[in-house]
């Protein structure tokens, strides 16, 4: 999906009002210095591309974050403020339902959410290019 035509300011508002708080809640009890950020993003479409991938793609040691509150709110924000996003996600959602597992907060998931926090912070940088 090409995130170029999203309403970035509306997504930023959704992040600041709720998503950021849900990420902090998920990370509660973890020191902010515990994980090194190894990925970043260039402009807002890039940030959303990486946020989407990191939030919804299973990775080694962290099978799924998709059912977490921050992920559901991220998905809703993208569906509302990115034209055509919902249609591209129908097949992906069906595949995700098939492989859904019991929620377990592993250290790898904490590390992944720490990376997500960094990507969202970069997305919100005032000087970051729209596209």
């Amino acid at each position: 999906y090409d995130f170029t035509n999203c309403d970035f300011e509306k997504i930023k508002a959704a992040y600041l009002s709720t998503i950021s708080k849900d990420l902090i809640t998920y990370m509660s009890g973890t020191k902010s210095t515990e994980f090194n950020n190894t990925v970043s993003c260039s402009n807002r479409p890039h940030c959303l591309t990486e946020i989407q991938s990191l939030t919804f793609n299973p990775t080694a040691g962290c099978a799924s974050l998709a059912k977490e509150m921050f992920a559901m709110k991220t998905k809703a924000a993208l569906a509302i403020w990115c034209p055509g996003y919902s249609e591209t996600q129908i097949n992906a959602t069906q595949a995700m339902k098939k492989r859904r597992k019991r929620k377990v907060t592993t250290n790898k998931c904490l590390e992944q959410v720490s990376q997500l926090q960094g990507l969202w912070r970069r997305f919100n940088r005032p000087l970051l290019k729209q596209q």
Partner: antibody, heavy 117, light 108 residues
Framework: QVQLQESGPGLVKPSETLSLTCAVS?????????WSWIRQPPGKGLEWIGY???????SYNPSLKSRVTISRDTSKNQFSLKLSSVTAADTAVYYC??????????WGQGTLVTVSS | EIVLTQSPATLSLSPGERATLSCRAS??????LAWYQQKPGQAPRLLIY???SRATGIPARFSGSGSGTDFTLTISSLEPEDFAVYYC??????????FGQGTKVEIK
Amino acid sequence: QVQLQESGPGLVKPSETLSLTCAVSGYSISSGYGWSWIRQPPGKGLEWIGYISYYGSISYNPSLKSRVTISRDTSKNQFSLKLSSVTAADTAVYYCARTNLLYFDSWGQGTLVTVSS
Amino acid sequence: EIVLTQSPATLSLSPGERATLSCRASQSVSNNLAWYQQKPGQAPRLLIYDASSRATGIPARFSGSGSGTDFTLTISSLEPEDFAVYYCQQYSDWPQYTFGQGTKVEIK
């Protein structure tokens, strides 16, 4: 520390597909960062080809996108480049590098690929 | 596509002298700029990122400055091992990251 090593044929015929592999040691490619390919034609500057991130997102240079595929094999801790329909203009030293998806902090030593019949 | 223009193409200096290399972007890249050093037959090495932050292990004689469209890499006092080609790279314009054409710093 992380080390990267490119391998693959040094000579490819025009119209064929160039295939290179980058073996990574000292760091798991599924643990963090992105893993990138960059090339440098003889005596010229650098050109970014694309990357695959540790969580599988892929990004390509738009000028090469139609011909490029980057993939990974986490069990072997390596990632690969395929460039199709090559011409003499694709003759270059090809580097693999570790990236934070912005800049490139560790590089392989590079491998020269010549496109010639 | 953002074009990076480096100047001069070649800089002839003696060890101990100060080197000032320029990189100009065709449009603003904020501080999203890196500098690399490349010696003959070797891969590039990251020197500076975010326009002014030194990469791990890079000596303090290397410094970067600038923002927007005009950037400078300064080597305060050239050591023999500093004679090489230097490239700038912008990462403001994903997915079109681009490099400058390079500046060669040679021994006078």
